[in-house]
Interface confidence: low
């Protein structure tokens, strides 16, 4: 505990390592013939305290013993945990200009004795691994602390390893470098950790374990799957394992799933049959192992095997709908539409659809395959027709779905009543209706069909539809519904051989239109004025237009204009008014109204009727 320096020595009592809360005496002594020249009595020894290389205190006032000019003893208290540096310097008081000269220094370490190590945990990775133990060291000692891990077992087996903790490294784990073999499966082993530093020592409680307690098998490797006869639902999972494994846990899931299917397999010997897989589905498989049925630890999960199950022929029924359009007196165009099967029904990549149109008396059959989800043909208007569609993948085809081609809106008695369309939120519309009042045949199902009321939508875009059971009188439509767009919604009631429909317009959100209709002409016929206009461009309508309003007033008049409100009909683009005085010049304009309000006015036109007014 003495640091030999040129000018003198510094000693510490009781020791340079002390427990927290203890005091220490530091003595600084000059060597013979050292000190201030000529006047030994002018030697003044001072003690400086440094923490982290920063001067924090001059201990001049803590002097407890002084041999003038030869040695001084200082008492230091309240030292904080860790290392503190003390430097003794010589101050020659007769020479104020010279700085104090360093004599010697000492480092004092303040710490605590180690706590008994706790929570010892040992593990051997695989049958050929080595035993490694970790523990909780307890509170930081702030001193270099040595740890000894000792293992003892049968046949006088003993083994020990050491490591230390200090301010740079932490010792809470040691690998003993020995391998426990399965033939010692029933044997008991004891480990103990001893901690020792300059302030004391402590020992853990003995920790007892068996081979099975600590050996964690290596995860299975070389995982593969064999699909029996290219089946999409049955496969044999195979893997390699360590020799002593008796229990496996398998987990597998479709890649987009959030929950695993779990299977326990005893004595599987690297093989297990799975029977409930979904065809044409990306799966992830993992396996874990255990060396004993009741004791021991599971291995980590193996690396994932990711693979797609093979295809199987499609199942399920295609959802078919159609449109009929008369071309002339003896021909009609039939457009068939169907929805793609969902993946669990398609069970593979759909390569094509088989479409059949057949006259019921079997006189005519039209057949085709298509990769699209629609098909159009011109057929005679005579006869009763039926259509069927099936979906095919590489393994086969689904059962055909049949639909009778009837006149969808041909039977007034089958028309649903009180059809309404209410906006529910930005992207759906609630459609409700009442059943037909006097249907002479039972309603088998309702079809709610909708399409945007925009130019060319019948030819450009397929319809959207929902099939509704006959006892339901409402449907929430959301597919392809956008705000500020007006949709034509039809509710069809279908019986076995007839159809009736009712139509309504609806939107999911609306605003007042951006502009009013543009008046294109005002003509006078038989004492009535006919106002003609062009409809508001589709993007500017911003929902379903309920009314048009025609305003007029005498030119230069300050009176309120008169107005005529007309129900909006897409097909109508002119309207008569008959309350204008002859030979008076009027200004006329139009606006459009949605459920959200009225548009700004359209263009103004002046007109002076000539004829006799009513």
């Amino acid at each position: 505990n003495i640091d030999v320096c040129k000018l003198g020595t510094v000693t510490v009592q009781p020791a340079p390592v002390i427990p927290l809360g203890s005091a220490a005496n530091i003595s600084c002594s000059l060597n013979p013939k050292q000190g201030c020249s000529h006047y030994p009595s002018s030697n003044e020894l001072i003690l400086l305290k440094f923490v982290n290389d920063v001067l924090v205190e001059n201990l001049h006032g803590k002097k407890v013993h002084d041999h003038t000019g030869h040695s001084s003893t200082f008492q230091v208290t309240n030292l904080s945990l860790g290392m503190t540096l003390f430097v003794c310097k010589l101050n020659c008081s007769n020479s104020q200009k010279k700085p104090p000269v360093p004599v010697c220094g000492v480092e004092i370490s303040v710490g605590v004795a180690p706590e008994p190590p706790q929570n010892i945990s040992c593990v051997q990775e695989g049958e050929n691994g080595t035993v490694a133990c970790s523990w909780n060291s307890g509170k930081v000692t702030y001193l270099k602390t040595n740890y000894t891990l000792q293992l003892s077992g049968p046949n006088n087996l003993t083994c020990q390893k050491q490591c230390f903790s200090d301010n740079r490294q932490n010792c809470n784990r040691l690998d003993l470098g020995i391998n426990l073999s399965p033939d010692l499966a029933e044997s008991r082993f004891i480990v103990r950790v001893t901690a020792i530093n300059d302030l004391g020592n402590s020992s853990s409680l003995p920790h007892t374990f068996t081979f099975l307690d600590i050996v964690i098998p290596l995860p299975p490797w070389d995982i593969r799957i064999n699909f029996l006869n290219a089946s999409g639902s049955r496969g044999t999972l195979q893997w390699e394992d360590e020799g002593q494994v008796v229990l496996n846990q398998l987990r597998y899931q479709p890649l987009n799933s959030t929950s695993w299917n779990m299977v326990n397999a005893t004595n599987a010997k690297g093989k297990y049959d799975l029977r409930d897989l979904r065809p044409f589905t990306e799966y992830e498989f993992q396996i874990s192992s255990k060396l004993h049925l009741s004791g021991g630890s599971w291995s980590n999960w193996s690396e994932s095997l990711r693979t797609r199950t093979p295809e199987e022929e499609p199942v399920g029924i295609l959802d078919i709908w159609y449109m009929k359009q008369d071309i002339d007196y003896d021909r009609q165009q039939i457009s068939l539409f169907w929805k793609s099967l969902n993946p669990s029904e398609a069970r593979g990549k759909i390569l094509h659809y088989q479409v059949t149109l057949q006259e019921v008396t079997k006189k005519t059959t039209l057949q085709n395959t298509t990769r699209h989800t629609s098909w159009t043909r011109v057929i005679p208007r005579t006869g009763a027709w039926t259509a069927s569609v099936s979906a095919a993948n590489s393994k086969g085809a689904s059962a055909p779905t049949h639909i009778n081609i009837v006149d969808l809106c041909g039977t007034g008695l089958l028309a649903p009543h009180q059809v309404s369309a209410k906006s529910e939120n930005m992207d759906n519309i609630l459609v409700t209706w009442q059943p037909p009042k006097k249907a002479d045949s039972a309603v088998r199902e309702y079809i709610v069909e909708w399409r945007a009321l925009q130019p060319g939508s019948i030819t450009k875009f397929p319809p959207h539809w929902l099939r509704i059971p006959p006892d339901n009188m409402s449907a929430l439509i959301s597919e392809n519904i956008k705000p500020y767009i007006c949709y034509e919604i039809r509710v069809h009631a279908l019986s076995e051989s007839q159809g009736g429909c009712s139509s309504i317009r609806g939107d999911s959100k609306h605003k007042a239109p951006v502009s009013g209709p543009h008046i294109t002409a005002i003509t006078e016929k038989k004492e009535r004025l006919f106002i003609s206009w062009t409809h508001i461009p589709f993007p500017e309508q911003r929902g379903c237009i309920l009314h048009y309003r025609i305003y007029w007033k005498e030119r230069d008049s300050t009176a309120q204009p008169e107005l005529c409100e007309i129900q909006y009909r897409r097909s109508q683009n002119s309207h008569p008014i008959s309350s204008l005085q002859p030979r008076v010049t009027y200004v006329l304009w139009m606006t459009a109204v949605t459920a959200a309000g009225e548009s700004p006015q359209g263009n103004e036109r002046e007109f002076c009727p000539q004829g006799k007014a009513n």
Epitope: S121, V123, Q124, E125, A132, S134, N172, I216, N300, E303
Partner: nanobody, 129 residues
């Protein structure tokens, strides 16, 4: 979806230093075991350093880097760092960041590739002599 993105690799002279960073997105990684592995051409991917993720974050190092490399994490920033000092030519490799979404406290498990369920794309470190 969880993603790990390494950065900070590059070319450095022997004896120099580099600091690798691994940014995790998609989940909070403060409780998960995190590790750095490396793979030199023609060799298996090997453990370099790891954090146990057991709340108190025990640090683990391969013997070959002990005293030279330091692993740390900033949970608030979802970032794990590897400070590499006194680099040697044999440290040349692609360095990968890995995360295990279950807490791992055994040294043996921390070292195993199979423990980790998320991996980054890697960053190249080249140490020239």
């Amino acid at each position: 979806q969880v993603q790990l993105q390494e950065s900070g690799g590059g070319l450095v002279q022997a004896g120099g230093s580099l600091r690798l960073s691994c940014a995790a997105s998609g989940r909070t990684f403060s409780n998960y075991a995190m590790a750095w592995f490396r793979q030199a051409p023609g060799t298996e991917r090997e453990f370099v350093a790891g954090l146990s993720g057991s709340g108190g974050d025990t640090e683990f190092y391969d013997d070959s880097v002990k005293g030279r490399f330091a692993i740390s994490r900033d949970s608030a920033k979802n970032t794990v760092w590897l400070q590499m000092n006194s680099l040697k030519p044999e440290d040349t490799a692609v360095y990968y960041c890995a995360a295990a979404t279950h807490v791992v406290v055994h040294y043996g498990l921390v070292r195993r590739r199979g423990t980790y369920d998320y991996w980054g794309q890697g960053t190249q470190v080249t140490v020239s002599s």
